[in-house]
C-alpha cells in the first residue's frame, strides 16, 4: 500500500508509480540506459525527499478521466 510523505526509490518507487498511475502508465523508460530528463526529476524528488501522492501523480503519463 502507498505510504504518504516518505522517500521512495528503487523498485519500491516503480511499484508505487504503477499503483498510483494504473493504466495511465508513467513518465520514464527502462532500462536505465534510457533515463529521461523528466524521470530525473522524480528521482531527485522522491529518492531523497518526502514524496507525496500529488507529486507522484504528476509523473503519470496521461490525466485521469473525470467522470
Amino acid at each position: 500500500a502507498y505510504r504518504p510523505s516518505e522517500t521512495l526509490c528503487g523498485g519500491e518507487l516503480v511499484d508505487t508509480l504503477q499503483f498510483v498511475c494504473g493504466d495511465r502508465g508513467f513518465y520514464f523508460s527502462r532500462p536505465a540506459s534510457r533515463v529521461s530528463r523528466r524521470s530525473r526529476g522524480i528521482v531527485e524528488e522522491c529518492c531523497f525527499r518526502s514524496c507525496d501522492l500529488a507529486l507522484l501523480e504528476t509523473y503519470c503519463a496521461t490525466p485521469a478521466k473525470s467522470e
Epitope: G10, G11, E12, P31, A32, V35, V43, E44
Partner: antibody, heavy 119, light 108 residues
C-alpha cells in the same frame, strides 16, 4: 561505452584524510544517482553513500556519517568522496557505481581504489 | 533497512557439479534481486538482474529464480572460471542498497 574510473586511494594514518574521485564517461552522468560502495579485505560489499542527480541531496551509511562527504561535479562528470577522521576499519577497496533510482542493478563498476588506514 | 542473508557462506565443488546458492531478504523485495560474481582483485560483475534475467554475455549455465523474500542462483555445470565469490543485492529500496554477505565457491 560506459566507464567509471576511481582514483585517490592510498596509505593514510588514523585520523587522516583522503579524497577519492570517480571519473565517469559513456552515459548521461547528470541523470543518475551516484553511489560509493566499499569492500574491506576478505569481506563483503558495503554501501557507503549516495548523491542525487543534481548533487543537492546526499545520504550516508551510519558507519561514515559525519566523517565522509560525497559530492559531484556534473560539468566534469566526476564523483568525489572526501574522507576525514579515517579509522582502521575504513580500510577497503572503494568502488563507485551508478543507480538509476528505478530498481536497476549496478551494471557498471570501476576497478576500485584501495584505501589503507594504518600507523 | 532491508537485510540480506546468503547461504552457504562457502562451498567446495568440482568441475561439472550443479551449484545452488540461496539469498533471503528480510522483507518482500518482489523481483528486485541481482546477482554478482567477483574474482580476487577484481570488481563485481553483474550476472543476473530482476531475479532471473541473464545479463548480456553471461553463460546460460547461470540461472536465477525466486520472488518475494527467497531467491536462488544456480550454476548448472560448474566450469573452472566459475570459482569465485557470489553476492546478491536488493534494488527494491534505494539509495542504501544492501548486499548479501557473499558465498565463496572453491575447488574441491
Amino acid at each position: 561505452e560506459v566507464q567509471l574510473l576511481e582514483s585517490g586511494g592510498g596509505l593514510v594514518q588514523p585520523g587522516g584524510s583522503l579524497r577519492l574521485s570517480c571519473a565517469a564517461s559513456g552515459f548521461t552522468f547528470s541523470a543518475y544517482i551516484m553511489t560509493w560502495v566499499r569492500q574491506a579485505p576478505g569481506k563483503g560489499l558495503e554501501w557507503v553513500s549516495s548523491i542525487s542527480p543534481s548533487g543537492g541531496y546526499t545520504v550516508y551509511a551510519d558507519s561514515v556519517k559525519g566523517r565522509f562527504t560525497i559530492s559531484r561535479d556534473n560539468s566534469k562528470n566526476t564523483l568525489y568522496l572526501q574522507m576525514n577522521s579515517l579509522r582502521a576499519e575504513d580500510t577497503a577497496v572503494y568502488y563507485c557505481a551508478r543507480d538509476s533510482g528505478f530498481g536497476d542493478p549496478f551494471d557498471y563498476w570501476g576497478q576500485g581504489t584501495m584505501v589503507t588506514v594504518s600507523s | 533497512d532491508i537485510q540480506m542473508t546468503q547461504s552457504p557462506s562457502s562451498l567446495s565443488a568440482s568441475v561439472g557439479d550443479r551449484v545452488t546458492i540461496t539469498c533471503r531478504a528480510s522483507q518482500s523485495i518482489r523481483n528486485y534481486l541481482n546477482w554478482y560474481q567477483q574474482k580476487p582483485g577484481k570488481a563485481p560483475k553483474l550476472l543476473i538482474y530482476a531475479a532471473s534475467k541473464l545479463e548480456d554475455g553471461v553463460p546460460s549455465r547461470f540461472s536465477g529464480s525466486g520472488t518475494g523474500t527467497d531467491f536462488t542462483l544456480t550454476i548448472r555445470s560448474l566450469q573452472p572460471e566459475d570459482f569465485a565469490s557470489y553476492f546478491c543485492q536488493q534494488s527494491y529500496s534505494s539509495p542504501g542498497i544492501t548486499f548479501g554477505p557473499g558465498t565463496k565457491v572453491e575447488i574441491k
